[in-house]
């Protein structure tokens, strides 16, 4: 195992559940702050949406369209002009992402707002199967601050099946968050944004390396879960959060003991939302199968605070608000493995709309 650089210097949790689960439920209502930025047009087509930060930049005329480099923000992830030909991108300038990668202007992008009443109950969506996610302390794993997120690189052997013949292996996990007073999940539910979100990125076993799978339908699959505040500390997450100070600087990488990755996800893997979208950062490659769990993972207020204040990004800016605005569905249907719609009848709706990875 490689030895890590700290700043270049150098078990189950919460009782009966890994997550201290909480159902999203149909009673989740958007707060005024998190309400959708525009009502849907009459034709049912989803509006283009932008971060409030982007909207502010537009109204103040701050965007410099001559370069993919965006103006500096307190939360932004920006690149210094070091070396030639950088593909700069930042969360403060998401409107410029298509200049970095044209796919970011694609029609089937992520994240999305999950409108419960518009989800289609799909009986064929079975509980996910995770194999080999309970890692031992050795070998150690690389934990890094890449300037955009905190990333845990996962070893070979973590296998996941979306369904028969749809097998994947986990590559890495990372988080998205806000600030102490602003939530930072990427996906939203009925317009409600959660404090943070975990993504576990998987590669289809049909491909040997990630670059082969980019843009291929079903080539990548991401498991996503919302992080929510609760009174108790989450001991599984503490195994990550306790190391954040060691990787506070952009580019820092350390080795930490292996942990139970499944304990970072909700305990109920049977209730989830499913849709086809994209990577949520450039190059925004499409064909990614998203699974967003209905059950949330519970962290203490202190843990969520630690996540939001511990890391630094480019140009000595805090690494915060690292989420992309929700993207239009453009006709996509979000499927649910359970009856999530408020007006769901005993009979499943849109049963035949179910897709399989790679279709």
């Amino acid at each position: 195992q490689p030895q890590g650089l700290s700043g270049m210097q150098g078990e189950p949790s919460l009782g009966d559940s890994s997550s201290g689960e909480d159902e999203l439920g149909v009673d989740v209502l958007p707060s005024e702050e998190d309400a959708p930025e525009e009502a849907d047009p009459p034709d049912g087509e989803d509006p283009p949406e932008v971060n409030s930060e982007d909207r502010m930049e537009e109204s103040l005329g701050l965007e410099d369209l001559s370069t993919p480099e965006a103006p500096e923000h307190s939360q932004g992830s920006h690149g210094d002009e070091k070396g030639g030909g950088h593909s700069h991108w930042s969360y403060g300038g998401t409107l410029l992402w298509p200049q970095v990668s044209p796919a970011c202007a694609g029609r089937f992008q992520s994240p999305v707002d999950i409108r419960l009443e518009r989800t289609a109950f799909c009986r064929t969506l079975q509980p996910l199967e995770l194999l080999g996610y309970e890692l031992q302390p050795l070998p150690e794993l690389s934990l890094s601050n890449n300037g955009h997120t905190v990333q845990l690189t996962l070893p070979p052997g973590l296998k996941m099946a979306l369904g028969p013949g749809q097998e994947y292996r986990a590559l890495q996990l990372h988080l998205h968050w806000g600030t102490s007073d602003h939530p930072g999940s990427e996906h939203t539910v009925n317009g409600h944004r959660f404090p943070a979100e975990i993504h576990v990125v998987h590669l289809s076993t049909a491909f040997s390396e990630l670059h082969e799978a980019l843009g291929r339908p079903g080539g990548l699959a991401v498991l996503a879960a919302f992080l929510q505040e609760s009174p108790e500390e989450n001991s599984a997450y503490e195994q990550l959060l306790s190391h954040l100070e060691e990787i506070s600087e952009e580019g820092s990488k350390i080795e930490i003991p292996g942990l139970d990755v499944s304990a970072l996800l909700p305990s109920d893997l049977s209730r989830y939302y499913r849709y086809e979208g994209s990577l949520t950062t450039p190059p925004c490659s499409q064909g990614v199968i998203w699974t967003v769990f209905n059950e949330t993972v519970k962290l203490s207020a202190k843990q969520l605070h630690t996540l939001s204040v511990s890391l630094w990004g480019p140009r000595d800016s805090r690494l915060q608000l690292n989420f992309r605005a929700t993207q239009p569905l453009n006709g996509r249907t979000i499927e649910a493995s359970f009856p999530a719609a408020e007006d769901s009848s005993p009979e499943p709706v849109h049963v035949n709309s179910c897709f399989t990875a790679g279709d």
Partner: nanobody
Framework: QVQLQESGGGLVQPGGSLRLSCAAS???????????MAWYRQAPGKQRELVAV???????QYSSSVKGRFTISRDNAKKTVLLQMNSLKPEDTAVYYC????????WGQGTQVTVSS
């Protein structure tokens, strides 16, 4: 197929300099600009050690043992990452590996650096 190819290694006297280069080929070229690039090294009988990192935004970090002597840089247009090594010491002798970290690790085959009088 080879995705990352290192070059520039060789034999150098203590106090001398070398410049290592890593070029991305094949599909690795497509993800190069978005990857954190790093140089690792492995001396005989020792664990592989992280030497320097440059993020996609250009932020750099160095191990304490090389800070002030080594400089990492990248050229996304040419899909290359460089490691300028000055004031070399015998303890810098190792095989140097290029690494691209973008959702998964990509590795080069390594290039030998020997510092000896």
């Amino acid at each position: 197929q080879v995705q990352l190819q290192e070059s520039g290694g060789g034999l150098v006297q203590p106090g001398g300099s070398l410049r290592l280069s890593c070029a991305a080929s094949g599909g690795a070229r497509n993800i190069f600009s978005f990857a954190a690039m790093a140089w690792y090294r492995q001396a005989p009988g020792k664990q592989r050690e992280l030497v320097a990192v440059i993020t996609s935004a250009g932020g750099t970090q160095y191990s304490s043992s090389v800070k002030g002597r080594f400089t990492i840089s990248r050229d996304n247009a040419k899909k290359t990452v460089l490691l300028q090594m000055n004031s070399l010491k015998p303890e810098d002798t190792a095989v140097y590996y290029c690494n691209a970290d973008y959702y998964q690790d990509y590795w080069g085959q390594g290039t030998q650096v020997t510092v000896s009088s």
